[in-house]
């Protein structure tokens, strides 16, 4: 297993609809044709897997069925979107990238993107 640098933004604010997008960029040492991307959430010293996807270079990402994530790839960049977020989902979202094929296997883990989610205030009742 060889190390690889992964960069991602430090902070992202989710939209009022609970959607957050960020770019995960990796410094590919070789010419990988198959890549696996995993998004991990770290909160209160607990790490959980949010979603995982694989792709062949030049293609869209293929996520697990019923995933809350979508994404596209362009060169060594992966554009990730997480949907259905609520205030309780605020936390550090870490991008993990694995170059699966051809060998050698490379692994890179980003420093994480702090995603802030603010639940929208309900609209006040109107007398009109």
């Amino acid at each position: 297993c060889k190390a690889m640098h992964v960069a991602q933004p430090a902070v992202v604010l989710a939209s009022s609809r609970g959607i957050a997008s960020f770019v995960c960029e990796y410094a590919s040492p070789g010419k990988a044709t198959e890549v696996r991307v995993t998004v991990l959430r770290q909160a209160d010293s607990q790490v959980t897997e949010v979603c995982a996807a694989t792709y062949m270079m030049g293609n869209e990402l293929t996520f697990l069925d019923d995933s809350i994530c979508t994404g596209t790839s362009s060169g060594n960049q992966v554009n990730l979107t997480i949907q259905g977020l609520r205030a309780m989902d605020t936390g550090l979202y870490i991008c993990k990238v694995e170059l699966m094929y051809p060998p050698p296997y490379y692994l890179g883990i980003g420093n994480g993107t702090q995603i802030y989610v603010i639940d929208p205030e309900p609209c006040p009742d109107s007398d009109f």
């Epitope: 198959e34 995982a52 996807a53 694989t54 792709y55 062949m56 293609n59 869209e60 293929t62 996520f63 697990l64 069925d65 995933s67 699966m100």
Partner: nanobody, 115 residues
Framework: QVQLVESGGGLVQAGGSLRLSCAAS????????MGWYRQAPGKQRDLVAS???????NYADSVKGRFTISRDNAKNTVILQMNSLVPEDTAVYYC?????????WGQGTQVTIST
């Protein structure tokens, strides 16, 4: 577990055409990518073409304009139509299945282009 069954390899003269087929079966997710790699003697396995469930395709530069990859999602089958073949296309062609949870190789089919 995913099984891949390939067919369609063989010997053809330069300038000719061949059609490779690969059928996937087993525990398949709703979305996955299928593709073709090839490996010439003494060389590494290189990606030739790939296609996603939605029909997004990608080709190696060396085959663009000559090879076409297509897919029948109802039958979980991928087709590689190879035209204007040249001796450099001689290799073992391997079908590839890739999803978020599973990866599989076909057994390989020999393609030989004679001059």
């Amino acid at each position: 577990q995913v099984q891949l069954v390939e067919s369609g390899g063989g010997l053809v003269q330069a300038g000719g055409s061949l059609r490779l087929s690969c059928a996937a079966s087993g525990r398949l997710s709703r979305t996955f990518t299928m593709g073709w790699y090839r490996q010439a003697p003494g060389k590494q396995r290189d990606l030739v073409a790939s296609i996603t469930t939605s029909g997004s395709t990608n080709y190696a530069d060396s085959v663009k304009g000559r090879f076409t990859i297509s897919r029948d999602n109802a039958k979980n089958t991928v087709i590689l139509q190879m035209n204007s073949l040249v001796p450099e296309d001689t290799a073992v062609y391997y079908c590839r299945f890739l999803s978020a949870s599973t990866a599989a190789w076909g057994q390989g089919t020999q393609v030989t282009i004679s001059t």
